[in-house]
């Protein structure tokens, strides 16, 4: 449906409210160092413009596109090359070459300062003093940290956000009810950020059909009584919704999002019977509850996949009618089947079917040679099946922390040449796969784990991508989105790695480290063990392990001492030393 | 045209009730949300309360929170603004809007751009 004036359309679907935190979040994920009171003052200008459009949509530039007039707006700002230096050459560009130009600056890591919380009590006058203010810094401050947070689900965060300050700043203690929510708010935006990173990292290096293929899956393992022409719109739906908001087409994702939770709902008898509860929740709930919605029972009695995917004497001419329809009605077969199997299991079974049809449909006897088909997945069923259970013994067996060193060590060892601060993060989260799923029977630990695997390795590749270092990262980032994990674990120690030279200033320790909180010293501690494997990465588990548990008793001994600096000075010199003898250094 | 009528203005009693009627009638619109306003002789329109047709959900000012209660009837397009314990300062022209957003605001928070359509308003004289 065509609209006269783009903008006035979705400031009147949207409201002013949402326009403009919408606005301000897409300028904040386009122009990242840009401070707070530069965007709003863009925003405001933008958010009075839509008005004029609402008023008479033929007024002068209310036909442009969403993409020009947002973009001429940030190309007004008059520091823009020295604060971005080479972005600042997208502004001599036409739509949509500009766009796409910005795009490809969005930072992952931006050099800004970490953000620190202030105490409860100023937070609260803060958020009392100028409410709008204070959240509209939030959404600030995480999207240009994030720049490509799922935006509508980014209101629905701040939504939260206000409430847990409405209640908790009048609360007997504060503290005790706000710094819970917050934390709670904080991991589960980290991982929400990390979630959609993936999403645009799939549509954005491997296309709209991988990314369609792993809607597919995942939708069809979510919805298993629903018909494959349900999914494959709610697929095509999907696929929009996050092609525009991985896009920076924020406005158009939200609303879409917001018509395909209205369209899920008022469907859901033919989609799935665990929608009830989220159906009855307003807009933004509506939508996270359904995203998040556990998968519904499989129908009872589903025949087996051979009759109509090998033993057919038309699988041929069905694949060669329409190549991916037929893929997608397997892949969807396959999942609704298996919600105990990971989705990217279910794609690697998917492209080894696609594979062997290839072959087979050119062959003399098609059927003969594509008759064992099935039995090629039992290897790839196993592979995953047999790394979990390992990897949860040994994280049972160790606890979250020194199973979280064992893979810093693991990976170091892999890829040395990767900057210690991407190793450790990578590492810490790699690590968190175990208190996140171990727990669960066998049939979720699967899903559970390598799909937490595969956006937790994007990150490494993301991160590694804008300061590449490694071939070897960059050749299992790159040659395929489904065999990450796997190309990953199958990585050996690199032979070609030159040791680092020792620096006895790494290893150098201060009594500050003392009034750090315990996530914050395992931080430190975890630096100085990805230090120590690239300065000998030929060292042995039991050597490593011995240092540390001196690192560790040698800071614990220091932090009860009277006079901790002194401590830390004298007592560290002979760890290094001992240290270096140990591992022959 | 879409016409929008509000009624059930009066004088009334500080601490005393007010109900507000508002129809929606004439040609076929998309009303996702109705909401009334009010506006103070030389202050600006400000929000009071709004209803959502898609999941009947309720939004309310600070000011008014516990003491006005909005209801509707989707079918009819009415809606229905409970005035309680009413206070001098609620004293003002209430007007009914209708055509808002099909999004519900992230922050609670409606403005008068947000509707489409409007009553021509009812006088609301709380006395002391």
């Known amino acids: 449906d065509a609209h006269k004036s783009e903008v006035a359309h979705r400031f009147k679907d949207l409201g002013e409210e949402n326009f403009k935190a919408l606005v301000l979040i897409a300028f904040a994920q386009y122009l990242q160092q840009c401070p707070f009171e530069d965007h709003v003052k863009l925003v405001n200008e933008v958010t009075e413009f839509a008005k004029t459009c609402v008023a008479d949509e033929s007024a002068e530039n209310c036909d442009k596109s969403l993409h020009t007039l947002f973009g001429d707006k940030l190309c007004t700002v008059a520091t823009l090359r020295e604060t971005y230096g080479e972005m600042a050459d997208c502004c001599a560009k036409q739509e949509p070459e500009r766009n796409e130009c910005f795009l490809q600056h969005k930072d992952d890591n931006p050099n800004l300062p970490r953000l620190v919380r202030p105490e409860v009590d100023v937070m609260c006058t803060a958020f009392h003093d100028n409410e709008e203010t204070f959240l509209k810094k939030y959404l600030y401050e995480i999207a240009r940290r994030h720049p490509y947070f799922y935006a509508p689900e980014l209101l629905f965060f701040a939504k939260r956000y206000k409430a847990a300050f409405t209640e908790c700043c009048q609360a007997a203690d504060k503290a005790a009810c706000l710094l819970p929510k917050l934390d709670e708010l904080r991991d589960e935006g980290k991982a929400s950020s990390a979630k959609q990173r993936l999403k645009c990292a799939s549509l954005q290096k491997f296309g709209e059909r991988a990314f369609k293929a792993w809607a597919v899956a995942r939708l069809s393992q979510r919805f298993p009584k629903a018909e494959f022409a349900e999914v494959s719109k709610l697929v095509t739906d999907l696929t929009k919704v996050h092609t525009e908001c991985c896009h920076g087409d924020l406005l158009e994702c939200a609303d879409d999002r917001a018509d395909l939770a209205k369209y899920i709902c008022e469907n859901q008898d033919s989609i799935s019977s665990k929608l009830k509860e989220c159906c009855e929740k307003p807009l933004l709930e509506k939508s996270h509850c359904i995203a998040e919605v556990e998968n519904d029972e499989m129908p009872a009695d589903l025949p087996s996949l051979a009759a109509d995917f090998v033993e057919s004497k038309d699988v041929c001419k069905n694949y060669a009618e329409a190549k991916d329809v037929f893929l997608g009605m397997f892949l969807y077969e396959y999942a609704r089947r298996h919600p105990d199997y990971s989705v990217v299991l279910l794609l690697r079974l998917a492209k080894t079917y696609e594979t062997t049809l290839e072959k087979c449909c050119a062959a003399a006897d098609p059927h003969e040679c594509y008759a064992k088909v099935f039995d090629e997945f039992k290897p790839l069923v196993e592979e995953p099946q047999n790394l979990i259970k390992q990897n949860c013994e040994l994280f049972e067996q160790l606890g979250e922390y020194k199973f979280q060193n064992a893979l810093l060590v693991r990976y170091t060892k892999k890829v040395p040449q990767v900057s210690t601060p991407t190793l450790v993060e990578v590492s810490r989260n790699l690590g968190k796969v175990g208190s996140k799923c171990c727990k669960h029977p066998e049939a979720k630990r699967m899903p559970c784990a390598e799909d937490y695997l595969s956006v937790v390795l994007n990150q490494l590749c993301v991160l590694h991508e804008k300061t590449p270092v490694s071939d070897r990262v960059t050749k299992c980032c790159t040659e395929s989105l489904v065999n990450r994990r796997p190309c990953f674990s199958a990585l050996e120690v690199d032979e070609t790695y030159v040791p680092k030279e020792f620096n006895a200033e790494t290893f150098t320790f201060h009594a500050d480290i003392c009034t750090l909180s315990e996530k914050e010293r395992q931080i430190k501690k975890q630096t100085a063990l990805v230090e120590l494997v690239k300065h000998k990465p030929k060292a042995t588990k039991e050597q490593l392990k011995a240092v540390m548990d001196d690192f560790a008793a040698f800071v614990e001994k220091c932090c009860k001492a009277d006079d901790k600096e002194t401590c830390f000075a004298e007592e560290g010199k002979k760890l290094v030393a001992a240290s270096q003898a140990a591992l022959g250094l | 045209e879409l016409q929008v009528v509000e009624s059930g203005g009066g004088l009334v009693q500080a601490g005393g009730s007010l109900r507000l009627s508002c129809a929606a009638s004439?040609?076929?619109?998309?009303?996702?949300?109705m909401g009334w306003f009010r506006q103070a002789p030389g202050k600006e329109r400000e929000f009071v309360a709004a209803i959502t047709w898609s999941g009947g959900t309720t939004y309310y000012a600070d000011s008014v929170k516990g003491r006005f209660a909005i209801s509707g009837d989707n079918a009819k397009n009415t809606v229905y603004l409970q005035m309680n314990s009413l206070k001098p300062e609620d004293t003002a022209v209430y007007y009914c809007?209708?055509?808002?957003?099909?999004?519900?605001?992230?922050?609670?928070?409606?403005?008068?751009?947000?509707?489409?359509?409007w009553g021509q308003g009812t006088q609301v004289t709380v006395s002391s």
């Open positions: 004439g040609r076929t619109f998309r009303s996702n949300t």
């Open positions: 809007a209708a055509e808002g957003p099909k999004w519900e605001p992230w922050n609670g928070i409606y403005h008068p751009a947000d509707f489409g359509s």
